[in-house]
């Protein structure tokens, strides 16, 4: 070996100075008599080496690196050898920090593995090999006096937890526990825990199960779940409190917590849930009233709440067939009475013949919102119910009676916007209980089966805004019927558009006769079109060669017009504008020339 490096310390605080010396022996005869010693840290040459020849002929270079900012680097002592750098010796330098105090030390007792598992947070990176040791001792009191030491627990590399096996534990007796961290720059110790392993016991959760329905037990109410749990047997003798959490499977709802529940409850009816909804449930327990850790949440149990019978009001309306008055078409609409009114599976219309107690004849069972049935001759009334698996809604009686009530007056309709119509009326005297408003396409597309209807429960109402199934440029027939206690009034109807279309084109102008100063024009009116409002008037426009314009307004029934006061032998451009309340449109332009003064009139 020609050279040898010695350093003040191979491991230092990051950023601290370090001093190194390199001595080259005299017997390295192949070297220059006065070799220049160079220093290199990693790949970089380092200036500042102070070189001297010692009395024994050896060469020494000393360098001080003011700040070692590399966590690991090689320091080399070199000589120039021809064109290359020859390394004579090198040392590994390391820099870092002493270990921080480990914090958040906590332990839990696992009764299944019979071990105390402690974990901690090691603190910031030291950049140096750092060992952690979990140290503990047995103590009779509150850990002020140290009893038998327990064998150190050394975690596997990189782990921040360690298990003290049962043979080193004393249950129901305190233990002092702390973590010691050590590296080349120092040692640190966490604050000491003083604990009885049983006070940090973490139990296994019970297993949730659905309760087997017993024949004598009442089924759960709507929005309720019956469940039970099987405690973790090895923890059965430990007093515990438990809590249940649940949430609907669908949607973004967060967990709702129920508790505390005694472990021994073993079975439980959970209510106040949404009916007919699938729920996810979990349970966990903790030793209580003595200290302990919460168990993990149990595996999920998925259960569905029973549904509730529909809680709806059924608004009804009916029509008789004109050809067969005993054939009735009944319509209805469910109106929820509560926020959660229950699922509707279907509807049943039934009739109970008088004198036949209990005998109910179903007239129809449907999922639709209407049905047609033959009304038995003696039937004046039927009952309508909505049903699901949990039961039926309260029956709605439907009475078929003659129209004996007074009629409403001054029925009128007006457009609000292209998709709504306002229908208004003057209420009759006495006030009705309410009104049925029906609407659908007017002629020629009218159809009884395609009508929309609504019930207005307020008998004092003087109008109703129709917002459903209204489209522009369509003629609607609107029928309003007042409803009384046991009868109804005669129906009234009105026709209206929510938005009318301007005429699509004006009639073509034709020249019938022409003279020197006049011209007779005629046209064939456009046939009326559905969705287009009737014409209100025509305007005829004519312009001479000097670009002077003239016009005349004609009523909508006009079929022709004579232009007077024209100049002879002059050119005129004429067009007709057809107008309605919805707008106007122009015909094509007719160009004509009046006759010369010497010419004869043309008829």
């Amino acid at each position: 070996e020609c050279g040898h490096i010695s350093v003040s310390a191979p491991i230092v605080h990051l950023g601290d100075p370090i001093t190194a010396s390199c001595i080259i022996k005299q017997n390295c005869s192949h070297l220059d008599p006065e070799p220049q010693i160079l220093w290199r840290l990693g790949a970089e040459l380092q200036p500042g080496g102070r070189q001297q020849r010692l009395s024994d002929g050896t060469q020494e270079s000393i360098i001080t690196l003011p700040h070692l900012n590399h966590t690991q680097a090689f320091l080399s002592c070199c000589l120039n050898w021809g064109n290359s750098l020859q390394i004579l010796d090198q040392v590994e330098l390391r820099a870092g920090y002493p270990p921080a105090i480990p914090h958040n030390l906590s332990c839990l007792m696992n009764l299944t593995t019979s071990s105390l598992i402690c974990q901690w947070e090691p603190g910031p990176e030291t950049h140096l090999p750092t060992s952690f040791t979990l140290k503990s001792f047995k103590s009779r009191g509150n850990c002020q006096t140290q009893g038998d030491s327990i064998l150190d627990c050394v975690p596997k590399d990189g782990q921040s937890h360690c298990c003290i096996p049962r043979k080193h534990l004393l249950l129901y007796q305190n233990m002092g526990i702390w973590v010691q961290a050590e590296n080349a720059l120092g040692t640190s110790m966490s604050p000491q825990l003083c604990l009885d392993p049983m006070d940090v016991v973490k139990l296994e959760p019970p297993m949730l199960r659905t309760m087997d329905p017993s024949p004598e037990a009442a089924p759960p109410q709507a929005g309720c779940l019956q469940l039970c749990w099987e405690p973790w047997q090895p923890g059965l003798h430990i007093n515990q409190k438990c809590e249940l959490r649940h949430k609907p499977q669908r949607g973004e709802a967060s967990w709702a917590l129920v508790g505390p529940l005694p472990l021994e409850a073993l079975q439980y009816e959970l209510c106040g849930l949404l009916p007919a909804t699938a729920y996810t449930l979990q349970i966990r327990c903790i030793r209580w009233p003595l200290p302990g850790h919460w168990s993990d949440w149990s595996p999920s149990l998925e259960l569905r709440t029973t549904e509730r019978a529909p809680t709806v009001r059924l608004d009804t309306w009916w029509r008789q067939r004109q050809l067969d008055p005993r054939t009735v078409q009944l319509f209805w609409k469910p109106v929820p009475l509560e926020e959660d009114s229950g699922r509707i599976q279907g509807y049943v219309v039934s009739w109970r013949p008088s004198g036949q107690a209990g005998a109910i004849l179903p007239l129809c069972n449907t999922t639709e919102l209407s049905c047609t049935f033959h009304l038995p001759s003696e039937a004046q009334e039927v009952a309508l119910v909505a049903y699901n698996s949990a039961g039926t809604s309260r029956p709605t009686p439907v009475v078929f009676s003659e129209s004996r009530g007074p009629a409403l007056t001054r029925l009128h309709a007006m457009a609000r916007d292209p998709h709504s119509l306002w229908v208004g009326w003057e209420p009759p005297n006495p006030w009705p209980q309410g009104y049925v408003i029906e609407w659908g396409l007017g002629p020629p597309s009218a159809s009884n089966s395609n009508k929309t209807w609504r019930m207005e429960q307020n008998g004092r109402a003087t109008g109703f805004l129709l917002k459903e199934n209204i489209r522009p440029f369509q003629l609607y027939e609107i029928i309003v019927t007042p409803l009384y206690q046991d009868t109804m009034g005669p129906s009234q109807h009105v026709y209206a558009y929510s938005q009318e279309m301007a005429p699509s084109h004006a009639p073509e102008l034709h020249l019938k006769h022409i003279g020197k100063t006049w011209a007779q024009l005629e046209w064939v009116p456009e046939p009326p079109e559905l969705g287009k409002s009737p014409l209100t008037h025509y305007t005829i426009f004519w312009t001479n060669a000097q670009n002077q314009s003239f016009s005349a307004i004609l009523n909508a029934s006009s079929r022709g017009f004579v232009l007077h006061g024209l100049e002879p032998a002059s050119l005129y451009h004429i067009h007709l504008m057809a107008a309605s309340q919805a707008g106007a449109t122009n015909s094509t332009v007719l160009t004509l020339m009046t006759l010369t003064p010497e010419g004869s009139e043309l008829h």
Epitope: T113, R166, K167, P231, Q233, P234, L236, H237, N239
Partner: antibody, heavy 118, light 107 residues
């Protein structure tokens, strides 16, 4: 000091009934599971039944299931064992015991002898 | 059900001897094993719970070990007052079973 005092033992004919009692003192009775263990003459120990601190959980040995009922009155610090349809093989010293959190019988009463014989 | 097999059923030993009694469970019971001592005409007394924990007031010559299915009670130096019958009991799952007992007699 924990004390458990059994009473109610005695001679009974097969098919008869007896009710054993165990008066507890020296600890918070309502916080602990309690149990009955029996020992037939010259034989080993046999677990009979246990009862949870509030009385909601009551496991039984198969040999007594349906005939014996364990109960407790936390207000009186007393444990009971109602024994019906007694058989000759139920003859034993019946011990009342306080259970620990890990299922160990921490303290035992002195026992009461039940003899089933015609 | 978890059955408990204790061996030997009896043994003779002298004062000062080291005595070992074993107990085997028919299936794993973690550390849920307890040891009791019973003297004639007396109620049993808890010695060791949870396999290796010495009950308060029990001399330290008694120790327990094992886990899973195989367990041992050791008396390091037998004393005159230790001649008795010893029982093991599992408390992992109901029904609880006791071992058949080991009678320790004076040689």
């Amino acid at each position: 000091e924990v004390q458990l005092l059994e009473s109610g033992g005695g001679l009974v004919q097969p098919g008869g009934s007896l009710r054993l009692s165990c008066a507890a003192s020296g600890f918070t009775f309502s916080l602990y599971w309690m149990g009955w263990v029996r020992q037939a003459p010259g034989k080993g120990l046999e677990w009979v039944s246990s009862i949870s601190s509030s009385g909601g959980v009551t496991p039984y040995a198969d040999s007594v299931k349906g005939r014996f009922t364990i109960s407790r009155d936390n207000s009186k610090n007393t444990l009971y064992l109602q024994m019906n349809s007694l058989r000759a093989e139920d003859t034993a010293v019946y011990y009342c015991a306080k259970l620990g959190e890990l299922g160990q019988y921490m303290f035992w009463g002195q026992g009461t002898l039940v003899t089933v014989s015609s | 059900d978890i059955q408990m097999t204790q061996s030997p059923s009896s043994l003779s030993a002298s004062v000062g001897d080291r005595v070992t009694i074993t107990c085997r469970a028919s299936q794993g019971i973690s550390s849920y094993l307890n040891w009791y001592q019973q003297k004639p005409g007396k109620a049993p007394k808890l010695l060791i719970y949870y396999a290796s924990n010495l009950q308060n007031g029990v001399p330290s010559r008694f120790s327990g070990s094992g886990s899973g299915t195989d367990f041992t009670l050791t008396i390091s130096s037998l004393q005159p007052e230790d001649f008795a019958t010893y029982y093991c009991q599992q408390s992992f799952y109901y029904p609880f079973y006791f071992g058949g007992g080991t009678k320790v007699e004076i040689k």
